[in-house]
Interface confidence: low
C-alpha cells in the first residue's frame, strides 16, 4: 500500500477558462492548413522554440509564443498524388509531417519529414546570433529521409544529432515494418541494427535518444535509445509490450567480415516499472510514453525519469519511474539473455563471454581495440546473437514514484525542473496527459530522502478542447513550460505563486518549492535573496512553525476553498 499510489487531489485545479482569465497560458491555436505540433527543439541561446508540424516548421519566441516565424515545407502535388494512389488519407497522411528537428551546427538545423510517405530532409538556416533573425529553408538541398523520418506520420522518430551524425530510431520502409536504429549523415557509411531479426528489435516504438558519457574519455561515449517493443516469444506468455533502454557506442563503425555496416555494440535491457498487486502478481506499466533526463553534477549519471502506462484495456493506469544510470550500466555488465531455440525459455548465458566483452566501446580505457572493425570474430558472432540482457533495470526504490489509476486520463509526457527551496532541492515534475492537462507534481522526501511522497500541486487545462499532449519542453532561463499537441502550442509559467492566496498559511500549505511568503504576498522564492522573512516548508507544509498568527487564520480559508 504505497502512499504514492493514492490519487491525491490537486491543490489547484484550473480550467482552460481560468488559465486564460488569470493570464497563465498563452496559446498558439495552430494554422488552418497545419496540425500535429509534435516535434520540439528548444534553443535557450537564441531564445527560440522550434516546432515541427504538418507542412510547417515554426520558430517561436520563448518570451511569448504569439511572436513567431514560420517556414512552409509542403510536398509536391505528385508526391501527394502518389501517396493518395497508395490508398493513404490525403489530409492525415499525404503531407509532410516534420519528425526530426535537430541542431546541426552553429548556424543550421537539420529537419526531416514524412514527405507524404516519401521521407525527405533538409537544412534550415537560423544564423549565428539571435539578432540575425534568420529562419529559412535551404530549398536547393534536399536529402533522402529514409532511415531518418518514418514514412507514416503515426510513427515517431527518436533522434539525436551529434558531431554531424544523425542517430535515429525509426521505421525505414513504406510499410512501417522495418524498424531500425540508424546512424546517417557524417563521413562514414550509414550504420543500422540487424534487419529482420526480432531478437534485436521487435516492432519497436521509439521514444528518445540521448548521449551519455561513460567515462572521462569521449571515446567511451554511448548513445542510449529508449523505446517500447513487443516482447519476444518465450520472454512472456501471450502478446506483451516491454519498455527498453538500448545502448550503442558512439564510435561503433560496424564489423569487418560480419555485421558490416551494422552495430556491433548494440545491447538492450528491459525497464521495469511495476507495483505489487493484491494477488501477489505485479501490475506492470510497460507502455513507455516519454523519458526525461535530469542532469546531475556528474554528466555520466543523469537521473532518468520515465512515464509509463499500462497495456491493459481493462485496467488503465499511468506511472512515473526513476532510474539511475549506475543501475543501467550494472545490467549491461550483467548476464546476456540466451536461448537454444525458438521454443526454449530465455536464460542467463552461462558460457564463456568473448573478450572484449560485447557492448564495450573500443577505446584505450577498457581494452586495446581501436575500432569495432578490429573486434575478433567471436565477439561479433556473440553480439549478433545476444543483443538482449537477461536482467531488467529496476527503478530507484524498486517502485514508481507516482501512479495514477482511477482517473479518465493517462500520462503522455514529462519534463522535470530541479528547484532550490529553503529546505533543500526538489524535483518538480510537469506531466502531460492525453486529455490536454498538465500536472505539476513535487517529490518530497518522507522519513528518508529515498522514500518520496508525491504532492500534486496543480492540474491545469492548457488547451480549449481535450487533446493529447505530445511534446513538452521546459525553459529554465524563461521559467516557462511549452506544450505541443495536434491542436497547437501552449506556453505557461512554471509557477503561479500569487494564485495560492493572500495569506502566509495558504502559501506555506501549497508546498510549491517555487513559492514562499515574503511577508506580504506569496511570490517566487529565490535562494539568493536576502529577505529575512521567507516562509516556506515544502517537506512538511507546516504553517504553524513558519507563519505568524495572522497568516495562520488563512489556513482555514485555504482548506475550505480547495477541498
Amino acid at each position: 500500500n504505497y502512499a504514492n499510489g493514492k490519487n491525491n487531489v490537486p491543490r489547484l485545479k484550473l480550467s482552460y477558462k481560468e488559465m486564460l482569465e488569470s493570464n497563465n497560458v498563452i496559446t498558439f491555436n495552430g494554422l488552418a492548413n497545419s496540425s500535429s505540433y509534435h516535434t520540439f527543439l528548444l534553443d535557450e541561446e537564441r531564445s527560440r522554440l522550434y516546432v515541427g508540424a504538418k507542412d510547417h516548421i515554426f520558430s517561436f519566441n520563448l518570451v511569448n509564443i504569439k511572436d513567431f516565424q514560420k517556414i512552409v515545407w509542403p510536398v509536391s502535388y505528385t508526391r501527394r498524388d502518389e501517396c493518395k494512389w497508395a490508398g493513404k488519407d490525403i489530409l492525415k497522411e499525404c503531407a509532410n509531417f516534420i519528425k526530426v528537428l535537430e541542431a546541426y551546427n552553429q548556424t543550421h538545423l537539420y529537419a526531416c519529414g514524412t514527405g507524404a510517405f516519401h521521407p525527405i530532409c533538409t537544412y534550415i538556416e537560423v544564423g549565428h546570433h539571435p539578432e540575425d533573425n534568420i529562419f529559412k529553408l535551404q530549398d536547393s538541398h534536399f536529402e533522402n529521409g529514409r532511415g531518418k523520418s518514418p514514412y507514416d506520420p503515426k510513427l515517431l522518430t527518436a533522434s539525436l544529432l551529434i558531431d554531424g551524425e544523425l542517430y535515429s530510431g525509426t521505421a525505414a520502409d513504406f510499410m512501417g515494418r522495418d524498424f531500425a536504429i540508424f546512424r546517417t549523415l557524417g563521413h562514414h557509411h550509414p550504420i543500422r541494427t540487424e534487419q529482420h531479426d526480432s531478437r534485436w528489435l521487435n516492432d519497436p516504438r521509439f521514444i528518445s535518444a540521448h548521449l551519455i558519457p561513460e567515462s572521462d574519455n569521449p571515446e567511451d561515449d554511448k548513445v542510449y535509445f529508449f523505446f517500447r517493443e513487443n516482447a519476444i516469444d518465450g520472454e512472456h506468455s501471450g502478446k506483451a509490450t516491454h519498455a527498453r533502454i538500448g545502448q550503442i557506442c558512439k564510435n561503433d563503425f560496424g564489423g569487418h567480415r560480419s555485421l558490416v555496416n551494422k552495430w556491433t555494440t548494440f545491447l538492450k535491457a528491459r525497464l521495469i516499472c511495476s507495483v505489487p498487486g493484491p494477488n501477489g502478481i505485479d501490475t506492470h506499466f510497460d507502455e513507455l510514453q516519454d523519458v526525461f533526463l535530469m542532469n546531475s553534477k556528474d554528466p555520466k549519471n543523469p537521473i532518468v525519469y520515465g512515464v509509463f502506462t499500462t497495456s491493459s484495456n481493462i485496467f488503465k493506469g499511468s506511472a512515473v519511474c526513476m532510474y539511475s544510470m549506475s543501475d543501467v550500466r550494472r545490467v549491461f555488465l550483467g548476464p546476456y539473455a540466451h536461448r537454444d531455440g525458438p521454443n526454449y525459455q530465455w536464460v542467463p548465458y552461462q558460457g564463456r563471454v568473448p573478450y572484449p566483452r560485447p557492448g564495450t566501446c573500443p577505446s584505450k580505457t577498457f581494452g586495446g581495440f581501436d575500432s569495432t572493425k578490429d573486434l575478433p570474430d567471436d565477439v561479433i558472432t556473440f553480439a549478433r546473437s545476444h543483443p538482449a540482457m537477461y536482467n531488467p533495470v529496476f527503478p530507484i526504490n524498486n517502485r514508481p514514484i507516482m501512479i495514477k489509476t482511477d482517473v479518465n486520463y493517462q500520462f503522455t509526457q514529462i519534463v522535470v525542473d530541479r528547484v532550490d527551496a529553503e529546505d533543500g532541492q526538489y524535483d518538480v515534475m510537469f506531466i502531460g496527459t492525453d486529455v490536454g492537462t498538465v500536472l505539476k507534481v513535487v517529490s518530497v522526501p518522507k522519513e528518508t530522502w529515498h522514500d518520496l511522497e508525491e504532492i500534486l500541486l496543480e492540474e491545469m487545462t492548457v488547451f480549449r478542447e481535450p487533446t493529447t499532449i505530445s511534446a513538452m519542453e521546459l525553459s529554465t532561463k524563461q521559467q516557462q513550460l511549452y506544450i505541443g499537441s495536434t491542436a497547437g502550442v501552449a506556453q505557461l509559467p512554471l509557477h503561479r505563486c500569487d494564485i495560492y492566496g493572500k495569506a502566509c498559511a495558504e502559501c506555506c500549505l501549497a508546498r510549491d518549492p517555487y513559492c514562499a511568503w515574503d511577508g506580504s504576498s506569496c511570490s517566487r522564492y529565490f535562494p539568493t535573496a536576502k529577505a529575512r522573512t521567507r516562509a516556506q516548508d515544502i517537506r512538511n507544509g507546516d504553517p504553524l512553525t513558519h507563519c505568524s498568527d495572522g497568516g495562520i487564520e488563512g489556513r482555514m480559508d485555504h482548506h475550505h476553498h480547495h477541498h
Epitope: S76, T78, R79, D81, E82, W85, A86, G87, N144, R146, D173, F174, M175, R177, D178, H196
Partner: antibody, heavy 116, light 111 residues
C-alpha cells in the same frame, strides 16, 4: 535468401484466360508490396500491376486495366495474376517482383504465348 | 515508345568508363527516385541502383548512379566483359500512376 518462383505460363488462344502464380520465400512476404512486370520477346520491360502488402490497394497499367486482376494470399506466401481476354500483344515473359520503392528482387519469369 | 528515353546501345573496352543516360519528365524522374536494372543475357533483371544513387549490397562500387533534374545516368567504371548486358532505368510516374521503364540500353564490351 529471397526467392520468387513463377508458374502458370503457357500457350493460350486469343480471348482465353490464364492464372499466373508466384511463390515467395526468404522474406516476410506479408510485409511487402508485390508486382508483375512483363517483357515481350526482344523488347524492353513493362510494368503490369502492383499490390499493397495487405491487398489494400491494387494498381494496373492502362494496357491491362479491366482484363487483369492481381491478388495475393499472405498465408500461402503467393502472388497471383489472373489474365482474362488475352490478346496477342500480351505475349511476354511475366516476372514477379518484390516491391520496396523499386523492384529489388525478381523471379526468373514464366512465358505466356497468346496465339491467334 | 517508352516514357523514359535511353540510348539503344553503348559500348566500351575493358577498363573504360561508360555512362548510360535516361531522360524523363517532372512526373517521373524529376520528382521520384530512379532505379537501374541490369539484365544479363537469358536471365531476369537485377536491381543495380535504387533511390537515384544507392547500391544494394553485393553490387560492386564500379556502378554508380546520379540524377539531375529530369535526367538520370548510370556510370560503370573499370568496365569488364561480364558487364555486357541490357540496362534499364525505371521510376514511378505520378501522372500515369504507374511504374515506367526506359527502353533499355544494350551494353557491349569490345575486344
Amino acid at each position: 535468401e529471397v526467392q520468387l518462383l513463377e508458374s502458370g505460363g503457357g500457350l493460350v488462344q486469343t480471348g482465353g484466360s490464364l492464372r499466373l502464380s508466384c511463390a515467395a520465400s526468404g522474406f516476410t512476404f506479408s510485409d511487402y508490396a508485390m508486382s508483375w512486370v512483363r517483357q515481350a520477346p526482344g523488347k524492353g520491360l513493362e510494368w503490369v500491376s502492383w499490390i499493397y502488402y495487405d491487398s489494400g490497394s491494387k494498381y494496373y497499367a492502362d494496357s491491362v486495366k479491366g482484363r487483369f486482376t492481381i491478388s495475393r494470399d499472405n498465408s500461402k506466401n503467393t502472388l497471383y495474376l489472373q489474365m482474362n481476354s488475352l490478346r496477342a500483344e500480351d505475349t511476354a515473359v511475366y516476372y514477379c517482383a518484390k516491391l520496396n520503392g523499386d523492384f529489388d528482387y525478381w523471379g526468373q519469369g514464366t512465358l505466356v504465348t497468346v496465339s491467334s | 515508345q517508352s516514357v523514359l528515353t535511353q540510348p539503344p546501345s553503348a559500348s566500351g573496352t575493358p577498363g573504360q568508363r561508360v555512362t548510360i543516360s535516361c531522360s524523363g519528365s517532372s512526373s517521373n524522374i524529376g520528382n521520384n527516385d530512379v532505379s537501374w536494372y541490369q539484365q544479363l543475357p537469358g536471365t531476369a533483371p537485377k536491381l543495380l541502383i535504387y533511390a537515384d544513387s544507392h547500391r544494394p549490397s553485393g553490387v560492386p562500387d564500379r556502378f554508380s548512379g546520379s540524377k539531375s533534374g529530369t535526367s538520370a545516368s548510370l556510370a560503370i567504371s573499370g568496365l569488364r566483359s561480364e558487364d555486357e548486358a541490357d540496362y534499364y532505368c525505371g521510376a514511378w510516374d505520378s501522372s500515369l500512376s504507374g511504374y515506367v521503364f526506359g527502353g533499355g540500353t544494350k551494353l557491349t564490351v569490345l575486344g
